[in-house]
Amino acid sequence: MRTEAQVPALQPPEPGLEGAMGHRTLVLPWVLLTLCVTAGTPEVWVQVRMEATELSSFTIRCGFLGSGSISLVTVSWGGPNGAGGTTLAVLHPERGIRQWAPARQARWETQSSISLILEGSGASSPCANTTFCCKFASFPEGSWEACGSLPPSSDPGLSAPPTPAPILRADLAGILGVSGVLLFGCVYLLHLLRRHKHRPAPRLQPSRTSPQAPRARAWAPSQASQAALHVPYATINTSCRPATLDTAHPHGGPSWWASLPTHAAHRPQGPAAWASTPIPARGSFVSVENGLYAQAGERPPHTGPGLTLFPDPRGPRAMEGPLGVR
């Protein structure tokens, strides 16, 4: 028996288009819309289990649903790699595996998924609401990271309900050519939508296959997911003893914000342009709690699970100090 929290991959709804063949002019907009929403967004899933036989023993499983080849997987805890976490294991498909206490066994499960078992005892053993993050570096999608944790109140042996998690990060996202095509497509889509603005909209059918409804529900409320793709970083903030922002960023704000690269290869790229989502200025942050956006100046509560968006981590020490890499 085990307790597990699954962070599923987010997928867009697949609306049925009534009379699609009769509205050929509307097929292209919907195809483009799907491309705009899904292109360049490979997904990472994270599953955290606590074994009933060893209450402080954890198994973390992570998978990458992109189509590219994985060049490196980094597993961290206490926060995302480079933003408050500590590296537990690094898995390279050719060069091997390196792990640090309390990691006991890291291994590849498939070509695109890994698992990590953590020791259950010791001063550095995890607690039940520790956040575990997996970062997949791949080509050509870039670097993607997602985080998950056990619900604080979960009992061993009970299965926690799946919780939607944002696709957390695209450091080195996509190929410029593809991005350009998609950008053109999205602009063209907007043009078409404006042309059809005053025409009756086609009636959409609910999907007839049972999996679709949950998928649509998972996507619909995922403003945080899309916002996460337009700010440099997002993490589920459920670490054991979360640091205050002052501690996590002792210099008043992420000092790496100003040094974020400006070349497109390192910019997070998301499915839709959220022009209304303000990008935080240096030293500020955006907090997403219960689907609400709050801007810098207010501190997100650190007493319970929440979603906090951070600028692109500056690196190891972001991890190392309060982070853990340095």
Epitope: S71, L72, T74, S76, G78, G79, N81, G82, G84, G85, T86, T87, V90, H92, E94, R95, R98, W100, A101, G122, A123, S124, C127, A137, S143, D171, L172, S239, C240, R241, P242, A243, T247, A248, H249, P250, H251, S255, W256, S259, L260, P261, H266, D312, P313, R314, G315, P316, R317, A318, M319, E320, G321, P322, L323, G324, V325, R326
Partner: antibody
Framework: QHELQQSGAELVRPGSSVKLSCKDS????????MHWVKQRPGHGLEWIGS????????EYSENFKGKATLTANTSSNTAYMELSSLISEDSAVYYC???????????WGQGTLVTVSA | DIVLTQSPASLAMSLGQRATISCRAS??????????MHWYQQKPGQPPKLLIY???NLESGIPARFSGSGSRTDFTLTINPVETDDVATYYC??????????FGGGTKLEIR
């Protein structure tokens, strides 16, 4: 074997600049930070700064801002540190070291001796 | 900046004895329930070598004679028993406060 290979010793004039290199032969280059550490003869270790490979982010100790400039060429897995306006107190062994979040500086180069002398 | 103070500055031990080196931080180096304190060994003419990471975790390939303990501001490196090969200078380092990864002043271990 994970090795960080540093460039050779440098003898330079006061006021000039020098650029040291550190090649990381291992895959960690893209997943960790490359740090630089100074050690003057008979002295302790002094952290200079770090370059984070996957985000191109640099961090500097207050003591070395304006003195050291950190860069990297990810295609060749090489990190660089340029020291400018050199003075005799800059004579030291400079180490590069890499590490993963929160786990210390796991891997070290052999060090590069820089001697500033007229 | 966090200041790390090591004591003693030098230590002369007999073979087989237990050597204890202390490192005190000017403020806590703990975060997320983890102590971001590390210990290094440096022999003359060589780069430092990581011995202990995060206060108490033995780095791969390091003999079990080395151990680390402590939390928040007070940390200890213990070598038991001391061997001839342990003659070196030992440094503590904190990595909890960005962007200053400060080192202690070092403790020189000698065999008498």
């Amino acid at each position: 074997q994970h090795e960080l290979q540093q460039s050779g010793a440098e003898l330079v004039r006061p006021g000039s600049s020098v650029k040291l290199s550190c090649k990381d032969s291992y895959f960690a280059f893209m997943a960790s930070a490359m740090h630089w550490v100074k050690q003057r003869p008979g002295h302790g270790l002094e952290w200079i700064g770090s370059f984070t490979m996957y985000s191109d982010a640099t961090e500097y100790s207050e003591n070395f801002k304006g003195k050291a400039t950190l860069t990297a060429n990810t295609s060749s897995n090489t990190a660089y540190m340029e020291l400018s306006s050199l003075i005799s107190e800059d004579s030291a062994v400079y180490y590069c070291a890499s590490g993963y979040s929160g786990n210390g500086f796991t891997y070290w180069g052999q060090g590069t001796l820089v001697t500033v002398s007229a | 900046d966090i200041v790390l103070t090591q004591s003693p500055a030098s230590l002369a031990m007999s073979l087989g004895q237990r050597a204890t080196i202390s490192c005190r931080a000017s403020e806590s180096v703990d975060n997320y329930g983890i102590s971001f304190m590390h210990w290094y060994q440096q022999k003359p003419g060589q780069p430092p070598k990581l011995l202990i990471y995060r206060a108490s975790n033995l780095e791969s390939g390091i003999p079990a004679r080395f151990s680390g303990s402590g939390s928040r501001t007070d940390f200890t490196l213990t070598i038991n028993p001391v061997e001839t090969d342990d003659v070196a200078t030992y440094y503590c380092q904190q990595s909890n406060k960005d962007p200053m990864y400060t080192f202690g002043g070092g403790t020189k271990l000698e065999i008498r």
